[in-house]
């Protein structure tokens, strides 16, 4: 996270990291007692390696009471996700067993309606990913407050140039962004997850490039399938 | 702790522009989106819009475009709001506002001492 | 636009009693926040995303709701509480405001 600052401890129950070999890869977000929601191009870059949940976590270091890792039973990306796109980037993880759910545990409500985010609305991200243009990492959680762009701006030829499908949304990326380290992590908009941080190697921090999000209720009849 | 310091009362004549001032202190000021509120004398409470003080980005409510802009001056950790071609149903108070905090939800937890605006000839 | 609409416009109520006051949304959110305000002063938050009381708002003050329909409970109603109370969405641009309601002590 660009621009943003370190989120108050515990107070977003449903954040997930995204592990491998015991390192912070993505971020994710827990939707169902035993699914996390993430993006599929986090799992190309987990290679052979043990995938795992972290939930319940602030920091990634220190022991925390409400921290515990969870072994994936199974990996579902969205079957239409491809490794040189960044259309249809979700990936679903079943945990082993259901988490433990608790103050600092908890799903986060996804939005079903199929409407597009007013622009201009504020919307919260939040993630490991890097804090700094040398790459930096922070051992605890980051949030930003991110306007949303209309998709006609993102859709320029100067910023995404048409790239951006219906199934997409974009927020503000002056200064303020989501950036590496952050994929699969939540777009929060009035409490609810309306986007999913896209995998890429997007430039971040550049008012040019806004930050592009899988809008999840455009894949409402993926997840329900999948967690059915 | 966070406060915020707003301009003195202004008596304005119908057809001319008003800037007022939102002094920060207690906090760093781009670091947080400022946003201002009418409170017209119904008491109705209306969202003008907000200002990110780092970059300038800002967003407004469509009822105030070619009304209301918002501006902001890190040097002086000052949000400035101009209103302009001013008429009686601009009488109002208005107020800066902002969220300091860092959860997932966002809210007006501190608020402008207001800034009342009488436009009459 | 969301349009919150809040009942009743003025309410009034004895000390010790319970009182109820509604915001309803013309489409669903997620959350309310309210804010009280008293003449003269700027409003303060009151109770913020649905249910949690700001700092140093009495215990006697509750706040639910889900959908288009929320709610403040006030369960002893005290002197002090006498103010208007406005209802606020935060989940589309333009954020938008209650009409408010006024409560009067007896």
């Known amino acids: 996270i660009l621009g943003g600052r370190e989120a108050e401890a515990h107070a977003r129950p449903y954040m997930a990291s995204v592990q491998v070999n015991g390192e912070h890869l993505c971020g994710g977000v827990l939707v169902a007692e035993q699914w996390v929601l993430s993006a599929a191009h986090c799992l190309e870059d987990a290679a052979d390696g043990k995938v795992q949940v972290l939930l319940g976590a602030h920091s990634l270091s220190q022991p925390e009471p409400s921290k515990r890792l969870y072994d994936v039973l199974r990996a579902v990306p969205h079957p239409d996700s491809r490794p040189d796109t960044i259309d249809h980037d979700l990936l679903l993880l079943q945990l082993s067993e259901k988490a433990t759910l608790g103050p600092a545990v908890r799903p986060l409500p996804w939005q079903r309606v199929d409407r597009d985010v007013e622009p201009g609305t504020l919307c919260d991200v939040a993630g490991w990913g890097i804090v700094s243009h040398a790459g930096r990492r922070p051992d605890r959680l980051q949030h930003v407050l991110l306007p949303v762009l209309d998709r006609a701006t993102c859709n320029r030829r100067t910023h995404h140039d048409g790239a951006i499908t219906q199934r997409m949304m974009c927020a503000e990326s002056n200064r303020r962004d989501s950036c590496k380290g952050d994929s699969g992590g939540p777009l929060v908009c009035g409490g609810v997850l309306e986007g999913v941080v896209t995998s890429g190697s997007r430039v971040c921090g550049n008012r040019k490039k806004p930050g592009i999000y899988t809008r999840v209720a455009s894949y409402a009849a993926w997840i329900d399938s999948v967690l059915a | 702790e966070v406060q915020l310091q707003q301009s003195g009362p202004e008596l304005v004549k119908p057809g001319a522009s008003v800037k007022i001032s939102c002094k920060a202190s207690?906090?760093?000021?781009?670091?947080?989106?400022m946003h201002w509120v009418k409170q017209s004398h119904g008491n109705i409470l209306d969202w003008i819009g907000y200002i990110d003080p780092d970059n300038g980005v800002s967003s407004k409510n469509q009822k105030f475009t070619g009304k209301a802009t918002v501006t902001a001056d890190k040097s002086s950790s000052t949000a400035y709001m101009e209103l302009r071609s001013l008429t009686s149903e601009d009488s109002a108070v208005y107020y800066c506002?902002?969220?300091?905090?860092?959860?997932?939800?966002?809210?007006?937890?501190?608020w402008g001492t207001g800034t009342t605006v009488t436009v009459s000839s | 636009q969301i349009v919150l609409s809040q009942s009743p416009a003025i309410l009034s109520a004895s000390p010790g009693e319970k009182v109820t006051m509604t915001c309803r949304a013309s489409s669903s959110v997620s959350y309310m926040h309210w804010y009280q305000q008293k003449p003269g002063s700027s409003p303060k938050p009151w109770i913020y995303?649905?249910?949690n009381l700001a700092s140093g708002v009495p215990a006697r003050f509750s706040g639910s709701g889900s959908g288009t329909s929320y709610s403040l409970t006030i369960s002893r109603v005290e002197a002090e509480d006498a103010a208007t109370y406005y209802c606020?969405?935060?989940?589309?641009?333009?954020?938008?405001f209650g009409g408010g309601t006024k409560l009067e002590i007896k």
């Open positions: 606020q969405q935060w989940s589309s641009n333009p954020y938008t």
């Open positions: 995303a649905t249910s």
């Open positions: 506002a902002g969220y300091y905090g860092s959860s997932w939800y966002w809210y007006f937890d501190v």
């Open positions: 207690g906090y760093s000021f781009t670091g947080y989106y």
